[in-house]
């Protein structure tokens, strides 16, 4: 018979291990990204990062970042992203609505595009992984 | 109830191509991989790729790129493996299998297929 | 790729026996790692997943355990029926490779 298992425990310090190697990653993606001359960031486009009413690691957008670096493997084919979208399923729960991305057109926009949402990505890891050591300090204090 | 029912044996001639179908039941799951597997007559498991059906997004084992493909059917929830260029030591048994939990990422695979056994021969 | 490395490849023990399997991770794979069951002419079963959770029906005789990239999978008392094939699988990055296998038979 089909019964659900229970409900995972998941031990900080995996929590905190997927989090650094996304933030790892991010850095190698923006770094792959900034090789591309003469592109500006846009105020156009701004990627979800941290939720201030949940706690971590549920308080990352973790559905909406993943859609957004969907649509930048779509436009350009950066293929560290794969390796990101595999950890962020990791903090992904399986009935998390789908995020809607509305595509730029235009060939320098998406580069404008592309540069943006992977800076934001880079910094939001940073911040992340903040949130998860400070809220560990705050946990065994 | 889970059921993850695959498609009947195969003998196909070496240099043709084999697509295996998965089809699944009772799976209410969206945001999932699942994988496909083999195992050679006396041999041990051996992974071959995967797909998140809800996009589409494949990966594949490095020793199967460009040999095989995945692909799934969500209005029919089936997913297929096609493995082409096939040789004699491709003769084996294919599964397809299905995680469950709470999270999009798997750690594990609760539901297995029936497997498939493909024989290639000339 | 992380590669599993399993041992030993084959053991026999009485019924009765304490049994335990390794599979080593040539990097930290956290706990994303399960442990199947595959008896001769079926499909694999999964016994243990996220490293040391049991699947729902497994007999509590089967439990898995963590040290590092060491991961253990113990049959507390062997039974007849748990002569088969048993598998590790990582599921860190993909490709989600397999250990070789530890075949288990009785004495």
């Known amino acids: 018979s089909h019964t659900l298992p229970v409900r995972l425990l998941r031990p900080s310090d995996d929590v905190q291990k997927i989090v650094e190697e996304l933030q790892s990653l991010s850095k190698m993606l923006l770094k792959d990204v900034e090789e591309e001359k003469g592109v500006l960031v846009s105020q156009n486009y701004t990627l979800p990062c941290l939720s201030p009413d949940a706690q971590p690691p549920n308080n990352i957008h973790s559905p909406a970042i993943r859609a957004y670096l969907k649509t930048i493997r779509q436009l350009d084919n950066k293929s560290v992203i794969d390796e990101i979208i595999e950890h962020l399923d990791k903090l992904i729960f399986q009935d998390a609505p789908e995020t809607n991305i509305s595509v730029p057109t235009d060939t320098h926009e998406c580069k404008r595009f592309i540069l943006t949402i992977s800076q934001q990505f880079s910094e939001c890891m940073d911040l992340a992984l903040k949130s998860l050591t400070s809220g560990a300090q705050q946990a065994t204090t | 109830q889970v059921q993850l029912v695959q498609s009947g044996a195969e003998v196909k001639k070496p240099g043709s191509s084999v697509k295996v179908s998965c089809k699944a039941s009772?799976?209410?799951?969206?945001?999932?991989?699942m994988q496909w597997v083999r195992q050679a007559p006396g041999q041990g498991l051996e992974w071959m790729g995967a797909?998140?059906?809800?996009?589409?997004?494949?990966r594949y084992s490095q020793k199967f790129k460009g040999r095989v493909t995945i692909t799934a059917d969500k209005s029919t929830s089936t997913a297929y493996m096609e493995l082409s260029s096939l040789r004699s030591e491709d003769t084996a048994v294919y599964y397809c299998?299905?995680?469950?939990?709470?999270?999009?990422?798997?750690?594990?695979?609760?539901?297995w297929g029936q497997g498939t056994t493909v024989t290639v021969s000339s | 790729a992380i590669q599993m490395t399993q041992s030993p490849s084959s053991l026999s023990a009485s019924v009765g026996d304490r049994v335990t399997i390794t599979c080593r991770a040539s990097?930290?794979?956290?706990?994303?790692l399960a442990w199947y069951q595959q008896k001769p002419g079926k499909v694999p079963k999964l016994l243990i997943y996220?490293?040391?959770t049991s699947a729902s029906g497994v007999p509590s005789r089967f439990s898995g355990s963590r040290s590092g990239t060491d991961y253990t999978l113990t049959i507390s008392s062997l039974q007849p029926e748990d002569v088969a094939t048993y598998y590790c699988?990582?599921?860190?990055?993909?490709?989600?490779?397999f250990g070789g296998g530890t075949k288990v038979e009785i004495k």
């Open positions: 299998a299905f995680p469950e939990g709470q999270y999009a990422a798997p750690y594990g695979m609760h539901y």
């Open positions: 009772g799976y209410t799951r969206t945001r999932y991989w």
């Open positions: 797909i998140y059906p809800g996009e589409g997004d494949t």
């Open positions: 990097r930290n794979i956290g706990n994303y």
């Open positions: 996220y490293a040391k």
């Open positions: 699988q990582h599921f860190w990055k993909t490709p989600w490779t």
